[in-house]
């Protein structure tokens, strides 16, 4: 399980309308459920139940976003509509370029994501926990526009966005 180097770029605006970017680095792990490759896109916070909904199935999708899902304690959702892997698959089907799971409350999800899948997703599925997860969720909960950049080697300086 390789280390995933995640950079989160936060867009902050000044009263004049100019935008400044703030970059935070954190690390996670690439799971076996997905591919070990770089990805980048706007962070879209997804509630685990938001991925249960089927009524978007016929949509044309928007692509190039990174889904961030904070998994709840298994006791709070004893009969989930989809497995963790199923949720990752649903997000990628809907256009996600990568999915990041915060597994802090549900560490068993790590095993589920790392079970050798015969048909892994073609996009990265990353999990974060502990201090890195707190850092990520603090940014996500700020209700700001943010972009995540996932790399499988430490980011070089100065940071540059790369192609989707």
């Amino acid at each position: 399980k390789e280390t995933a180097f995640v950079e989160v770029v936060l867009f902050e605006s000044s009263p004049s309308g100019d935008y400044t970017t703030y970059t935070t680095g954190l690390t996670g792990r690439f799971s076996r459920a997905g591919a070990t490759l770089s990805a980048e896109g706007e962070i879209v916070q997804m509630h685990p139940l938001g991925l249960c909904n089927n009524n978007d199935e016929e949509d044309l999708y928007e692509y190039g976003w990174v889904g961030v899902v904070k998994l709840e304690q298994p006791e709070l959702d004893p009969k989930p509509c989809l497995t963790v892997l199923g949720k990752a698959k649903r997000a990628v089907q809907r256009g996600a370029t990568a999915v990041i799971f915060d597994v802090s409350e549900n560490p068993e999800a790590i095993d589920q994501l790392n079970q050798g899948s015969e048909d892994p997703l073609k996009r990265p599925v990353v999990y974060v926990k502990g201090a890195d997860a707190i850092k990520l969720m603090n940014i996500v909960n700020k209700q700001k526009v943010a972009r995540a950049r996932i790399q499988h080697r430490p980011p070089r300086q100065p940071t540059e966005y790369f192609d989707m």
Epitope: Y19, V44, N55, L60, E62, W65, V140, K142, Q143, M164
Partner: antibody
Framework: EVQLVESGGGLVQPGESLKLSCSAS????????MHWIRQVPGKGLDWVAY???????LYAAAVKGRFTISRDNAKNTLYLELTSLKSEDTAIYHC??????????WGRGTLVTVSS | DIQVTQSPSSLLASLGERVTITCQTG??????LNWYQQRPGQAPLLLIY???SLQTGVPSRFSGQYSGRSFTLTITSLEPEDIANYFC?????????FGAGTKLELR
Amino acid sequence: EVQLVESGGGLVQPGESLKLSCSASGFTFSNYGMHWIRQVPGKGLDWVAYITNSGGSLYAAAVKGRFTISRDNAKNTLYLELTSLKSEDTAIYHCARGYSYPGPYWGRGTLVTVSS
Amino acid sequence: DIQVTQSPSSLLASLGERVTITCQTGQSINNYLNWYQQRPGQAPLLLIYFATSLQTGVPSRFSGQYSGRSFTLTITSLEPEDIANYFCLQHYSPPYTFGAGTKLELR
């Protein structure tokens, strides 16, 4: 079927305010980011504002501090509040679904005319 | 703001002809550029996202390429329904900016 329907446009005087609505149906509104884009009839497109599914927002410099984008996920509705309107704000205002970019679904637009 | 310069502003072409429209950006935006088509009286339609990806349902005669800060939309063989206005949009860095547009007309 995904549908986006704008309303609330009309004729106002410079300095006045207006609140536009975009009613969404056919998809899980709370899962998606939404944009407002405007167009002077017969002219080019002008990106106005964006709101993430969780409420973060971005604005064009020309409208920052005067326009406010918001959403009510319970009502499946996107809003754009326009204040201190200027004649150059006259345009058709479209809402569009999408994350960092306006995607395949756009509304037909509502016309805002600012004139004394 | 990132400047987006679109050319030409208008274009006369014949049916079956190959058509190319260009957008140049003032700074590097990698592949964060989309192309939209707008027919008279209609809302814009997304053709190409992230510079080269064809939106579902869009005919394969449309394609996008880029090199550095130069982006092109190509229609390999012009059809009557392609007569419209075309716009590019950079969504790399806010505030997002559209090109001024290209009016494509029949020769």
